[in-house]
């Protein structure tokens, strides 16, 4: 299996930003996406049977979606850093997706405002 | 208790459509892939189709000699899965088992009774 | 698709016997993807392997599964009365998904 994601990402103070991954080549069966920050802090889980849990600490900043993808919002200087999605999947394990975001100040933004929510 | 309870089949003439039934009940539903699996003397066990999870994006997969005649469906506020036939055939005929798997940590396979399909003119 | 060849395709064995039943994929199958089924006559088919070798719940441990790429085997170390039934390989490795055509296991 691959997990493809967004890659290396820029958004502006301030804004929102898609964080997407996606696992193909295997006919595993997703059973949760977790969805963690760069100091290893959870944000968010996608279960196969319980559905959606967005963490205490993000629920104003976080949205779930589109699809096993996560939304953040209201997005400060702090929020640049890594982000990772790992899928559990059966019977093949977990698969596991890096993200790198860097959030620009609204100026140098403008150049950069390819993943950018408008 | 895990109980899958298939219903909808019987006799049809060959041309002819069918839609086939499956109510879960014991398990969480919808953290389960579900299978349609068919059974007859002439061609023993044939997977159908299956319908994956929301997580799986509701993903649906057919066996080649169903492809563009059957839809599988589903809808988890009912705990149930359907197979829609169309354009039956002769061949189409044998007991159909509905199939549900889930892991949550340990893996779970469970299986209806059956239903019946005959086509036959 | 990957086509699942079991043999033999009816055997009868002796209680206390060990029982050997194969299945030979027509390409490489994944280990974890696959199965094998119990059935008993008039009855609808029971996980009884999976994983290649994970015995699913209730399985008497005198079970056994093992294989790789395109050669599997379900073992029984000592043939009771209750094993008699149908045994079928599945594999969801790659589509379509098939099954072996059974082994029929009798009681001599």
């Known amino acids: 299996g691959t997990i493809e994601t967004t890659g290396n990402i820029s958004a502006k103070k301030g804004g929102s930003v898609i964080l997407q991954c996606h696992l193909s080549s295997t006919m595993a069966q997703v059973t949760q996406v977790n969805w963690e920050q760069h100091d290893h802090s959870l944000l968010a889980i996608r279960n196969a049977e319980l559905g959606w849990h967005i963490y205490p600490a993000f629920k104003d900043r976080v949205a779930p979606g589109p699809g096993l993808g996560l939304t953040l919002q209201s997005l400060t200087m702090n929020d640049t850093g890594e982000y990772f999605c790992t899928y559990h999947t059966y019977p093949d394990g977990t698969y596991r997706g890096r993200i790198f975001l860097e959030v620009l100040e609204s100026s140098v933004a403008e150049h950069s405002a390819r993943f950018q929510i408008p | 208790e895990v109980k899958l309870e298939e219903s909808g089949g019987g006799l049809v003439q060959p041309g002819g459509s069918m839609k086939l039934s499956c109510v879960a009940s014991?398990?969480?539903?919808?953290?389960?892939?579900m299978d349609w699996v068919r059974q007859s003397p002439e061609k023993g066990l044939e997977w159908v189709a299956e319908?994956?999870?929301?997580?799986?994006?509701?993903?649906?997969n057919y066996g080649e000699s169903v492809k563009g005649r059957f839809t599988i469906s589903r809808d988890d506020s009912k705990s149930s899965v359907y197979l829609q036939m169309n354009n039956l055939r002769a061949e189409d005929s044998g007991i159909y088992y509905c199939?549900?798997?889930?892991?949550?940590?340990?893996?779970?396979?469970?299986w209806g009774q059956g239903t019946t399909l005959t086509v036959s003119s | 698709q990957i086509v699942l060849t079991q043999s033999p395709a009816i055997m009868s064995a002796s209680p206390g016997e060990k029982v050997n039943l194969t299945c030979s994929a027509s390409s490489s199958v994944s280990s974890g993807y696959l199965y094998w089924y119990q059935q008993k006559p008039g009855s609808s088919p029971k996980l009884w392997i999976y994983g290649t070798s994970t015995l699913a719940s209730g399985v008497p441990a005198r079970f056994s599964g093992s294989g790789s790429g395109t050669s599997y085997s379900l073992t029984i170390s000592n043939m009771e009365a209750e094993d008699a039934a149908s045994y079928f390989c599945h594999q969801w490795s790659s589509f379509p998904y098939t099954f072996g055509g059974g082994t029929k296991l009798e009681m001599k």
């Open positions: 199939r549900g798997a889930l892991y949550d940590g340990f893996y779970f396979d469970y």
């Open positions: 319908i994956r999870t929301k997580v799986n994006n509701h993903a649906t």
């Open positions: 014991g398990f969480t539903f919808s953290g389960a892939w």
